[in-house]
């Protein structure tokens, strides 16, 4: 790595959890002094080039599209920037995982995902997402729909023949709201995942704000009723005056 430059970013433009045979676009941060950018996959501590972009596109971030995702293409990726004949810079690494049934079928069964204490919580509360499976599982991964960052990974615990992992979201903020799924994986290939659990929607409701809205609505209704009452009184009085004359 050259000097004290910040490490360039690498990101998956969609989710880093890719369905079998799906595709993903990887973006490497443009480096002004680089004349080419290589996309490397890291397998067993060995770096292998799987893509290469020349410096044509000015300061545009080089992009790479990986099609027909499978277990061989899952793993850790890194952008390597060539800035001289023997001078390189490297990005951070990106983990891509593939989800779908493997041929051996050991990941065929989906895990289940549940939430404690409730799927609707207030900010500041503690929430636990519990991922479980009756089949052998080494690690569980938790991903949030639409999030480009890497999924959370936890080693599974064996509880009375059930494999499980507890993902703690504490304290909850509005950013935690969304749809979650969990996956099983085995240590033989940590980048290959089972099919996802059923989606779980976590609603982070700001009750203070909701109560304020409710109070505001109630006040508006009362005000409207008051206006209508005054109007009715006024109309009624006017009618009496007319009758008298």
């Amino acid at each position: 790595q050259e000097g004290d430059f910040p490490m360039p970013f690498i990101s998956a433009k969609s989710s880093p959890v890719i369905p079998l045979d799906g595709s993903v676009k990887i973006q490497c941060q443009a480096i002004r002094e680089a004349y080419l950018t290589q996309l490397m996959i890291i397998k067993n501590s060995t770096y292998r080039e799987i893509g290469r972009r020349l410096k044509f596109w000015n300061e545009t971030d080089p992009e790479f599209v990986i099609d027909h995702m499978d277990a061989n293409k899952a793993g850790r990726y890194q952008c390597q920037y060539r800035i001289g004949h023997y001078r390189f810079r490297y990005s951070d690494t990106l983990e891509l995982v593939v989800t779908g049934e493997e041929p051996a079928g050991r990941l065929r069964d989906r895990p289940s995902l549940s939430v404690r204490p409730s799927p609707s919580v207030a900010p500041g509360e503690n929430v636990t997402l519990l991922c479980q499976s009756g089949n052998r599982t080494d690690t569980f991964l938790l991903s949030k729909e639409g999030a480009a960052h890497r999924p959370l990974r936890l080693r599974s615990q064996d509880q009375d023949g059930w494999y499980q992992a507890e993902f703690s979201l504490s304290p909850v903020t509005s950013a935690h709201g969304g749809t979650y799924r969990c996956y099983r994986s085995l240590s033989t290939n940590p980048y290959l995942l089972s099919q996802p659990s059923e989606p779980l929607a976590l609603l982070v409701a700001d009750y203070t704000m909701q109560n304020l809205i409710r109070m505001g609505l109630a006040a508006s209704v009362l005000l409207l009723l008051g206006i209508l009452l005054c109007q009715a009184r006024h109309d009624h009085g006017g009618a009496r005056e007319a009758a008298r004359s």
């Epitope: 676009k25 893509g51 290469r52 596109w57 000015n58 545009t60």
Partner: antibody
């Protein structure tokens, strides 16, 4: 299934103009760089033009620079090649080709081609 | 520009044989050479890129080797459907350039 279908070829007089089109289907068009490659009557292949996936940047070899313009419409999944000041040496079969998502200058899908004849 | 010289321009072989086609670059292109197959009535097919990487879906009887300036396409256990025109192309630097092609006939 990836498909590229070229159209617009024909007979043009030297100095004339013509616009070729390529209709793409079966893939996310806006993710890929697209190119035109031609095959001369003596069966040689020549790269003619490339356009970046976003449609911002274009590249040409010196022999067509200033005469040919590549463009794309990502909303319609179409690629175009506007050719002007045509010469007899531009006579060729013109292919639309998709660049792979991983390497510049590498063409993983090609169309069937459309023929341009430049002759008086 | 990088000039690519392809040889032979014509080749005839029998089914089951192994054949080789060569390409030489006018300057070093590292490993960045691709091979394409052109068959009558079909669209051009990318066989090999980066010198030796087999494109997905291509039969394993096709293989590529070489780096620097000299490269080879090998087709082992030749099959009748391998009758085609074969082209090499450098994808190291602009402008992308192709070899002159090799016409392979099956005896």
């Amino acid at each position: 299934e990836v498909q590229l279908v070229e159209s617009g070829g024909g007979l043009v007089k030297p100095g004339g103009s013509l616009k070729l089109s390529c209709a793409a289907s079966g893939f996310t068009f806006s993710n890929y760089g697209m190119s035109w490659v031609r095959q001369t009557p003596d069966k040689r292949l020549e790269w003619v033009a490339t356009m970046h996936s976003g449609g911002t940047y274009t590249y040409y070899p010196d022999n067509v620079k200033g005469r040919f313009t590549i463009s794309r419409d990502n909303a319609k999944n179409n690629l175009y090649l506007q050719m002007s000041s045509l010469r007899s040496e531009d006579t060729a079969m013109y292919y639309c080709a998709r660049e792979t998502g991983l390497y510049d200058g590498l063409f993983d899908f090609w169309g069937q081609g459309t023929t341009l004849t430049v002759s008086s | 520009d990088v000039q690519i010289t392809q040889s032979p321009s014509y080749l005839a072989a029998s089914p089951g044989e192994t054949i080789t086609i060569n390409c030489r670059a006018s300057k070093t292109i590292s490993k960045y050479l691709a091979w394409y197959q052109e068959k009558p009535g079909k669209t051009n097919m990318l066989l090999i890129y980066s010198g030796s990487t087999l494109q997905s879906g291509v039969p394993s009887r096709f293989s590529g080797s070489g780096s620097g300036t000299d490269f080879t396409l090998t087709i082992s256990s030749l099959e009748p459907e391998d009758l085609a025109m074969y082209y090499c192309q450098q994808h190291d630097e602009y402008p992308w350039t192709f070899g002159g092609g090799t016409k392979l006939e099956i005896k």
